[in-house]
Amino acid sequence: SQVSQNCHNGSYEISVLMMGNSAFAEPLKNLEDAVNEGLEIVRGRLQNAGLNVTVNATFMYSDGLIHNSGDCRSSTCEGLDLLRKISNAQRMGCVLIGPSCTYSTFQMYLDTELSYPMISAGSFGLSCDYKETLTRLMSPARKLMYFLVNFWKTNDLPFKTYSWSTSYVYKNGTETEDCFWYLNALEASVSYFSHELGFKVVLRQDKEFQDILMDHNRKSNVIIMCGGPEFLYKLKGDRAVAEDIVIILVDLFNDQYFEDNVTAPDYMKNVLVLTLSPGNSLLNSSFSRNLSPTKRDFALAYLNGILLFGHMLKIFLENGENITTPKFAHAFRNLTFEGYDGPVTLDDWGDVDSTMVLLYTSVDTKKYKVLLTYDTHVNKTYPVDMSPTFTWKNSKLPNDITGRGPQ
């Protein structure tokens, strides 16, 4: 049903869904802090622009007794229950921030007449692609897929002179929410990744993964997995690995690789880590002090969601335009705004663009080093280390199929 929005006469409200089921197990208090910090910045920016308006956030909590799994499995109903709560209270803001689970976002988008924008810190799955009023502030699976296809096909780098067309994907079902949807996208037979590869097999058992590491009859030298170094170690341990195996470890929301005192363990030498370029001012900010490196991005996405709303509100108010219109709801895309940690770019479909970074372990220094960067906005790879000190032969990435000549 249509719910009136608290969104006019100089008073603008943001509805923040505080769901028990979340993409990351982050205390709701930390997310509240992030939102409040964002509000302070927005108020300052609006004041500086000569706009004398009130901006507030309403935190909508769900009934933790019913939806208490803590992860995203039971989030579908929780999201709809919260919407029902908003509807009953007749208290909808100009914008909805949250949910972060793909299931709940998909269902909420499907089951509501969305004449208001929805901003999500998460919703990684392909089912949330191309939604007209949904904005996603953490890299969705589609962006990862485009990087992987681009990297697989690349053969014009000093350290990668072969195009690849094959891969194993390790997916055992215990993944975190982001990894679950990333791997789900790679597994899907109709996805861009599957379409562009000649051979792809999903490994679901630990033993399958372990056997491939030394199997002379393997169909690919490349294995994609998602998680942190500890996750890989639990699986691989100190097992021997064939010299032309390349493990791609997707660990986007983890800043720890860039910390000064970090040394790469020996089991990471055959691994390329795909992560996001770290923020520079986050480490000391008040809202992120209590956060682990993996959680910073999640809280930051909430904060940036507030700043995005402030950015759009300022534009519409300066142009004398109405906020409670479909035009406003559809405007949260194809733009760059000033985020907490620098400019944030959203693509034509409202998905955040970012710089992905591929790291390798230097055999000389045992440190993680940047091999290349990838700009998701222009789908382009930029080599950083032209002469990496790889573990692989001739300091070049091997072919994806043993014994195959140049591609």
Epitope: P158, V370, T381, M386
Partner: antibody, heavy 118, light 113 residues
Framework: QVQLVQSGAEVKKPGASVKVSCKAS????????MHWVRQAPGQGLEWMGI????????SYAQEFQGRVTMTRDTSTSTVYMELSSLRSEDTAVYYC???????????WGQGTLVTVSS | DIVMTQSPLSLPVTLGQPASISCRSS????????????LSWYHQRPGQSPRRLIY???NRDSGVPDRFSGSGSDTDFTLKISRVETEDVGIYYC?????????FGQGTKVEIK
Amino acid sequence: QVQLVQSGAEVKKPGASVKVSCKASGYTFTSYYMHWVRQAPGQGLEWMGIINPSGGSTSYAQEFQGRVTMTRDTSTSTVYMELSSLRSEDTAVYYCARDGQWLQFDYWGQGTLVTVSS
Amino acid sequence: DIVMTQSPLSLPVTLGQPASISCRSSQSLLKKSDGNTYLSWYHQRPGQSPRRLIYKVSNRDSGVPDRFSGSGSDTDFTLKISRVETEDVGIYYCMQGSHWPPTFGQGTKVEIK
């Protein structure tokens, strides 16, 4: 406008080293890779290597591995190419060339003639 | 490495007449990762440094007269000059940037008959 200005001509004895500079202006120095290309008298163009001015990492053509060193000084927006153990066959004009889009040479320096003679 | 072969190596032309230079690569220059073909043409006048005329097969650099055009795909490429002028003399090089390392053709010398 984009300009690449190279150091002057050099005459060297066999076995010596030469260091050629290339000063860039008119663009953000660290945002573009730089290549070195040489041309022996009456011969074609030969790619020598590339440097990433942002981090200083390099990659060299097989033929020059061990003899060439490319460096940069971001404070002066200058890249350098040093070639050691010179022999008469290294007599050539050495060019720096900016990479406008990975492996696309859009601007060239005026060239530096290096003569190796005893 | 990709071998680039130009022909002819020498091309005597009459002023005002068309000229055509061919460039063949030992492998396809279609870059799989982005669908582009990175084939450029350079012109070097006597005593000068090379100047890029064409990039990505057929795109003219700014300031390059429209009498120059590039065409081709896969492994076969052509540079055409519709009407040769005096300033067009010199050596023309094709260069590929689709594979590592970048490689040049051996050059085609254009002179007025």
